[in-house]
Interface confidence: low
Amino acid sequence: DTHKSEVAHRFKDLGEEHFKGLVLVAFSQYLQQCPFEEHVKLVNEVTEFAKTCVADESAENCDKSLHTLFGDKLCTVATLRETYGEMADCCAKQEPERNECFLQHKDDNPNLPPLVRPEVDVMCTAFHDNEATFLKKYLYEVARRHPYFYAPELLFFAARYKAAFAECCQAADKAACLLPKLDELRDEGKASSAKQRLKCASLQKFGDRAFKAWAVARLSQKFPKAEFAEVSKLVTDLTKVHTECCHGDLLECADDRADLAKYMCENQDSISSKLKECCDKPLLEKSHCLAEVENDEMPADLPSLAADYVESKDVCKNYAEAKDVFLGMFLYEYARRHPDYSVMLLLRLAKAYEATLEKCCAAADPHECYAKVFDEFQPLVEEPQNLVKQNCELFEQLGEYKFQNALLVRYTKKVPQVSTPTLVEVSRNLGKVGAKCCKLPEAKRMPCAEDYLSVVLNRLCVLHEKTPVSEKVTKCCTESLVNRRPCFSALELDEAYVPKAFNAETFTFHADMCTLSEKEKQVKKQTALVELVKHKPKATKEQLKGVMDNFAAFVEKCCKADDKEACFAEEGPKFVAASQAALA
């Protein structure tokens, strides 16, 4: 299916609006520090060029690959060397090395100021004055902060962002209408970004076999009535889509995602009874809906798996003939029967089954050797079940903030070398698992919790890869994708760690503390907690609780005082001295 001009092909397939949006996202994800106006100029130039190619596919340069065209355009940025340093060296390379070079320089933690939300009236004026620029700015700001955001999904977020302003800027109480919608988009956006980052890490660090295994398990849970052949086709197509998006091929990715949505809606009967309501929606909404669709009901009376995968005398013959297909079928059959298991658990079971067959099919009596393979699954299943049970009990007992604090202490003791902002961010997000998953019925808790934790721990791995400081973190992040969470869970207090020297400056607070939002206050307190644990890794829960309670009381007292700053200046050193004494 070759085209004389790839850029013309994609422009015609996607339409001008989506084409321009995706090119803006691509450029913003590559050159994260460039000003908005610079990117808009580049996008307009690319769009005008694409239109000449639509008019005449034989026109000069229209036959060039998208990587060549986009890379050439990025390399025209005048300030590339000053702004990006060694990334400018990418421009000396030829494709495909140049694109690989750009990909390697994507920054998961760019040094960009946090987005400040202006007053509602200011935003509504900007929206009405120039809707197109307003929405482009949204794409640009999100994309540069989230360089792996799933591009076609970001277009869907932008459409919802536009709809929120269109509705709420006409409302009687604009703020009451708009702010909850913006909060929801922000939270969903962060979650979407983190989920996609795991997909890209899976593909880039562990290869497409790892991603395909994940997809087989997840799609088999979602579509338990679908044939293995059908699931395999969906997995192949989905892998192509995500490989493209993670590789910066955003036009191809969006085009292929649209094709996949079309295929699924045309073949609902052989996929799932749950797709109907998605398939009536417009493209962006439809694709989102299909990705989030609930699990279909499991077929009645599925026979036991043991017959084909344990009792059969042909297991080793079947395994030897087509290892990946046989293991894929095992994973499919197991996953469709277990919507109550996390995908990561299912992948561990498939890994354990594979290891058993590797060992047993070389043994004198293979059947005797693998006869008890399903019994070996029990401890693998019980470990996450127990973990979820214990942590949900703790969450229910403590509430979210204190549960986050317990995790902060736990993870700081495990990996105290990791930077304090990273430990605070990751532990706060780990703590959100409680509110997200513990309220769910038993059968949904494990898939919710463990697969969410995998996403959060991937963030730790991604940040740590940029600035590696802990061999333990490197080991857990790189040895096995499916065992990352159990690896981190198994880490104990790092006995080799030399405690951080006490720094009074770290525990010095000012009156500005009183004007912070509740969330910002929590982050300040949690930052202090991490620093305390780094100073005294062997401090007991009781000691830390005592210090944190004193801290809360000290802040509350000073924020009620008439002269807040004087109170902080006077009470702060007392708090520090008392804390040191309590932890001595």
Epitope: K225, A226, E227, F228, A229, E230, D269, S270, I271, P299, A300, L302, P303, L305, A307, D308, E311, S312, K313, D314, K317, N318, E321, A322, V325, F326, M329, Y332, E333
Partner: nanobody, 115 residues
């Protein structure tokens, strides 16, 4: 591309017999267990019978035990269902599937039992 093509269905009187065939292509037929599934008008799919890859282990739904026999010929890449003592309630479209799926991955073959 995986393809499964069923044949052998038709109209038969109660107590009669039929033999369904399923020709497979596009995958290593001999490596996979196979099943027969049926879907009666207005009802959901119902698993009927399964056979392991080597043809040694067979399983049947309670409703057809003793009347239907599943078999396979790996050399011919074909799955069979011998149906004896047919009853009106066996009327359905019959599908063959890879593994133990109860979804319709193929066109199926219509079996109608009526006097």
């Amino acid at each position: 591309e995986v393809q499964l093509v069923e044949s052998g269905g038709g109209l038969v009187q109660p107590g009669g017999s039929l033999r369904l065939s399923c020709a497979a292509s596009g995958f290593t037929f001999g490596s996979f267990g196979m099943s027969w599934v049926r879907q009666a008008p207005g009802k959901g799919p119902e698993w009927v019978s399964a056979i392991d890859s080597g043809g040694t282990d067979t399983r049947y739904a309670e409703s057809i035990k003793g009347r239907f026999t599943i078999s396979r010929d790996n050399a011919k890449k074909t799955l069979y269902l011998q149906m004896n003592s047919l009853k009106p309630e066996d009327t359905a479209v019959y599908y063959c599937t890879i593994g133990q799926s109860t979804s319709r991955g193929s066109q199926g073959t219509q079996v109608t039992v009526s006097s």
